[in-house]
């Protein structure tokens, strides 16, 4: 769950996510609303996405733990455990080499995002 | 080691109910999903269903009205139980560990009056 | 849900050869792909996972590979105790799939 989200993210980005990312703009951190601000936001709204759709499958998603190894930079998933683990691990993934792709338009404004400025519509999955 | 075992009846009546059990070792339930395989004599693999290391259950949808997968986690053993049995579900069965690299020696079962 | 198309159904073939078996997956699985084989009364056994790593105790010989949907398996120079028929399995959603098989029998 989010040990394992927290670690991945840490390893890929190189930067601490309590820092940095949770919250982070309308959709990193718990929760999220409106139009994302910013493709690190975007990263966030598809993982949140992500998340639904193994909800839906019935996944625990905060309590199932995962093992992968992180090596030369890159993400391998245990090919071991349960379908949730597993797909859980790919979710988290992908959204740590978004965060990664998208460093260089990190802004430090939407670090702490108020959430009622969060308008628009929320992008469907 | 691990170890899954199929048992049942080897043979059923038309319009009865198929009780299967899969006994396992080595390893706990509530950590891997298990998963119910069968293959009629002659023919290829079919997915039947799993029961997840969280309880969930999901069937193949050509069957769900039929099939129930259940499990005892004190006892190490998964159950599937099917209903209204026809020839055609004649085959042998097979409990799998996911993601499918251990599987139980397989228990054919004849549906036939 | 994701069919797997397996392709031939049978491939006569002699002992030496090489030979290739492929599944073309309806949608994008990713490396959830698995190669078993199977012989007369047995259970499947696990050859191939994440569609190109040889499972423990499997022969050098068989190899896994990807391009883009469809997935290989290949049996470098073919032995008496590999003719047996095969399947693909994709697990990338929870209601996994398998092909149709394969029979590789001698020529």
């Known amino acids: 769950g989010i040990l394992n989200l927290n670690k991945m993210v840490k390893q890929v980005t190189g930067k601490m996510p309590i820092l940095s990312y949770w919250p982070y703009g309308c959709h990193c951190g718990l929760g999220g609303r409106g139009q994302p601000k910013d493709a690190t936001d975007w990263c966030c709204q598809t993982h949140d996405c992500c998340y639904d759709h193994l909800k839906t499958q019935g996944c625990s998603i905060y309590k199932d733990y995962y093992r992968y190894n992180f090596s030369q930079g890159n993400i391998h998933c245990s090919d071991k455990g349960s379908w949730c683990e597993q797909q859980l691990c790919a979710c988290d993934k992908e959204v740590a080499f978004c965060l990664k792709r998208n460093l260089d338009t990190y802004q430090k404004r939407l670090r702490f995002y108020w959430r009622p400025h969060c308008r628009g519509q929320t992008p469907g999955c | 080691q691990v170890q899954l075992k199929e048992s049942g009846p080897g043979l059923v009546q038309p319009s009865q109910t198929l009780s299967l059990t899969c006994t396992v070792s080595?390893?706990?339930?509530?950590?891997?999903?298990m998963h119910w395989v069968r293959q009629p004599p002659g023919e290829g693999l079919e997915w039947m269903g799993v029961?997840?290391?969280?309880?969930?259950?999901h069937y193949n949808s050509t069957l769900k009205s039929r099939l129930s997968i259940s499990r005892d986690t004190s006892k190490s053993q998964v159950f599937l139980e099917m209903n209204s049995l026809q020839t055609e579900d004649t085959a042998i069965y097979f409990c799998?560990?996911?993601?499918?690299?251990?599987w139980g020696q397989g228990t054919l079962v004849t549906v036939s009056s | 849900d994701i069919q797997m198309t397996q392709s031939p159904s049978s491939l006569p073939a002699s002992l030496g050869d090489r030979v290739t078996i492929t599944c073309r997956a309806s949608?994008?699985?990713?490396?959830?792909l698995r190669w078993f084989q199977q012989k007369p009364g047995k259970s499947p056994r696990l050859m191939i996972f994440?569609?190109?790593n040889l499972a423990n105790g499997v022969p050098s010989r068989f190899s896994g590979s990807r391009s883009g949907s469809d997935y290989s398996l290949t049996i470098n120079s073919l032995e008496s105790e590999d003719l047996a028929i095969y399947y693909c399995?994709?697990?990338?959603?929870?209601?996994?799939?398998f092909g149709g098989g394969t029979k590789l029998e001698l020529k």
């Open positions: 994440g569609a190109t």
């Open positions: 799998s560990r996911y993601p499918f690299a251990y």
């Open positions: 399995l994709q697990h990338k959603e929870y209601f996994p799939t």
């Open positions: 949608q994008d699985i990713g490396d959830y």
């Open positions: 080595g390893f706990s339930l509530i950590s891997y999903d």
């Open positions: 029961i997840w290391s969280n309880g969930n259950t």
